[in-house]
Amino acid sequence: MMTGTIETTGNISAEKGGSIILQCHLSSTTAQVTQVNWEQQDQLLAICNADLGWHISPSFKDRVAPGPGLGLTLQSLTVNDTGEYFCIYHTYPDGTYTGRIFLEVLESSVAEHGARFQIP
């Protein structure tokens, strides 16, 4: 039975040109995390495999950095980076857990005026 839950940073915002850390945390289960996939809509950003290490998609290698931990750092943000991001945890023996983060990338001037999502 799958008892775990994924905690995420929820809805977040960041300034264009800046960077942001995407973080998920799996709790309430003793299942072993074997792999975490990071996806933007249906596009793979990165994989962190417990045994093989990181795979960063070549399309994003110049502006995606692994970590911290199982998280992912997005750099040189553009408005096009606005959207949904998913962390997909493969675990043993539970199976797959998925978390969702919504990122809005704001023009610097807008961000300075406090138009930000609150983290629930």
């Epitope: 074997t34 792999q35 793979l44 994989i47 495999n49 417990a50 045994d51 093989l52 290490g53 990181w54 795979h55 998609s57 070549p58 399309s59 290698k61 110049d62 493969h90 043993y92 797959t96």
Partner: antibody, heavy 119, light 107 residues
Framework: EVQLVQSGAEVKKPGASVKVSCKAS????????MHWVRQAPGQRLEWMGR????????KYNEKFKSRVTITVDKLSSTAYMELSSLRSEDTAVYYC????????????WGQGTTVTVSS | DIVMTQSPDSLAVSLGERATINCRVS??????LAWYQQKPGQSPKLLVY???TLAEGVPDRFSGSGSGTDFTLTISSLQAEDVAVYYC?????????FGPGTKVDIK
């Protein structure tokens, strides 16, 4: 066009080391991880390890961990695999193979380098 | 290590007929399975990754299916140039391991 061109065949004595090179072209070398896989005569393919050419970080098959070293030279877009303490069972064709876009499989392979270990 | 087995060891199929190769894995690898084709004296060539995604430039007579521990590669209409050994490989953990191969010939 993606190309992985490997160094020529080698004949080595037991106990010696061999270093095989793999020159990449047709893509951005540092954006794609590189794997090394070998195939002994009549045997299945055997994965040896992988490297991130950007950071130099590598992961190895535990079976080879004490004997294999995978390195890169970013300036020449070349990957290297060195295997030490050679024995007759290491006689095989050694392949470099580029990691794919979407995971740890390999989408392009070098032509292979035959390494013969014989006294 | 994750153990890969393939069946059959070899098969002979008439031109234009269907060829089916199975790969069984010792533990759940979700859909992290690749198929390669290796012709005599050549390097392996990627056909399928993530169990069912066809690699660039691969003819659509090839298809992959399955998830978990059981996977299949199908050649819907065998052509003369398909004579080769076919290997499955999981791409899920260390070490990456390959099946023993299935040799496909023309009947």
């Amino acid at each position: 066009e993606v190309q992985l061109v490997q160094s020529g065949a080698e004949v080595k004595k037991p106990g010696a080391s061999v270093k095989v090179s793999c020159k990449a072209s047709g893509y951005t070398f540092t954006n794609y991880y590189m794997h090394w896989v070998r195939q002994a005569p009549g045997q299945r393919l055997e994965w040896m390890g992988r490297i991130d050419p950007d950071s130099g970080g590598s992961k190895y098959n535990e079976k080879f961990k004490s004997r294999v070293t995978i390195t890169v030279d970013k300036l020449s877009s070349t990957a290297y695999m060195e295997l030490s303490s050679l024995r007759s069972e290491d006689t095989a064709v050694y392949y470099c193979a580029r990691e794919g876009h979407y995971g740890f499989y390999s989408d392009y392979w070098g032509q292979g380098t035959t390494v013969t270990v014989s006294s | 290590d994750i153990v890969m087995t393939q069946s059959p060891d070899s098969l002979a199929v008439s031109l234009g007929e269907r060829a089916t190769i199975n790969c069984r894995v010792s533990e759940n690898i979700y859909s992290y399975l690749a198929w390669y084709q290796q012709k005599p004296g050549q390097s392996p060539k990627l056909l399928v990754y993530n169990a069912k995604t066809l690699a660039e430039g691969v003819p659509d007579r090839f298809s992959g299916s399955g998830s978990g521990t059981d996977f299949t590669l199908t050649i819907s209409s065998l052509q003369a140039e398909d004579v080769a050994v076919y290997y499955c490989q999981h791409h899920y953990g260390n070490p990456l391991t390959f099946g023993p191969g299935t040799k496909v010939d023309i009947k």
